[in-house]
């Protein structure tokens, strides 16, 4: 089941997928002025590696299909490659069968990346410099499906300016822990939902991709 | 495959300085966090410095803080390092990573200390002796 919207955001503070769940699609899309190979619409995360490699081309001129057939014969070649870039595996890297790393980068990919995510994607969050948590749970958000439908819980995470940092957790300590509600699991209600409502710019966009693969 | 290039390693003298080049042909500089890690014979790998494309902000380790500057050249798709005042702690085989930012562009250096870049390039060593 594919999530819709995208994760919460978080005042100060950035997410992002430590590893993608199998099923995950990553749009290929190309920067101004590239284009992407029409063979390669999309990568798709299968066991633990991406079932393609994306790759974009100038317009300024149109590849012969010769050289394009050549290219996707080398993807096998590439794919084995890429597992090769990364000398050191880090602990906090999830390493699992059924999840794939960020892809690396390819040449003249778009700046902003579109994942289609699928249920129980987890995404972590991290202040940004100059900012420091004060955190009552985990920061991250997970893609769960709740009454039909799903969507990503609420991150436990605040990112106040360093410098007043102290002056929060004074706050904190005198107030004692406020305990965040446990989300529902067993009720449907029709009315209200444990989730985040996502505003129209966060509501992701069923794209081509999709529809495609669903048919 | 996108490939990471490293340059300007060599033998230096304490107090000396050296710039570190870093070529990435083809990256979309706006989508990533790059920079340098080093390691040094029989210590682990650390993050040094990073810049990223998206705004500019940079990281320093606190270890070569005011010593180091990182720097960008996007229309040479470059990444610089410029080390003055080398001490013969900083001895060690310097690598050209990046790592995608989060949401919005991004970045948090937790991620840059974790080590765990989606591309690394081969390393230029520096080697700093009297």
């Known amino acids: 089941e594919l999530c819709l919207y995208d994760p919460p955001e978080v005042p100060n503070a950035t997410f992002k997928a430590l590893s993608y769940k199998n099923g995950t699609i990553l749009n290929c899309e190309c920067k101004r002025g590239f284009r992407r190979l029409k063979e390669l619409v999309y990568m798709r995360c299968l066991g633990n590696s991406w079932s393609s490699n994306c790759q974009c081309t100038s317009n300024s001129h149109d590849k012969s299909r010769k050289q394009v057939t050549a290219q996707l014969e080398h993807q096998k070649e590439q794919q084995t490659t890429t597992d090769m870039q990364k000398p050191t595996q880090s602990m906090h890297q999830e390493n699992l069968t059924g999840h794939c790393r960020e892809p690396p980068p390819w040449k003249h990919e778009d700046s902003k990346r579109i994942y289609h995510f699928v249920e129980g994607q987890s995404v972590h969050y991290e202040c940004i410099p100059g900012y420091k948590a004060l955190q009552r749970g985990p920061a991250i958000s997970i893609c769960k499906m709740k009454c039909g439908k799903t969507g990503w819980t609420q991150p436990q995470l605040t990112c106040v300016d360093e410098r007043e940092h102290h002056r929060f957790l004074a706050s904190e300590e005198s107030q004692g822990s406020r305990n965040s509600s446990p989300e529902s699991e067993t009720s449907c209600p029709i009315t209200t939902t444990d989730f985040p409502q996502p505003t129209e710019t966060t509501a992701m966009t069923e794209t081509f991709v999709l529809t495609m693969e669903y048919k | 495959q996108l490939q990471l290039v490293e340059s300007g390693g060599d033998l230096v003298q304490p107090g000396g300085s050296l710039r570190l080049s870093c070529t990435a042909s083809g990256l979309t500089f706006d989508g990533y966090a790059i920079g340098w890690f080093r390691q040094a014979p029989g210590k682990e790998r650390e993050g040094v410095s990073y810049?990223?494309?998206?705004?500019?902000?940079?990281y320093y380790i606190d270890s070569v803080k005011g010593r180091f500057t990182i720097s960008s050249d996007i229309a040479k798709s470059t990444v610089y390092l410029q080390m003055n005042t080398l001490k013969p702690e900083d001895t060690a085989v310097y690598y050209c990573?990046?790592?995608?930012?989060?949401?919005?562009?991004?970045?948090?250096?937790?991620?840059?200390?974790?080590?765990?870049?989606?591309?690394w390039g081969k390393g230029t060593l520096v080697t700093v002796s009297s």
């Open positions: 810049i990223t494309g998206s705004n500019g902000s940079t």
């Open positions: 990573a990046v790592d995608r930012l989060g949401s919005r562009g991004l970045y948090a250096s937790s991620w840059w200390r974790s080590g765990d870049m989606d591309l």
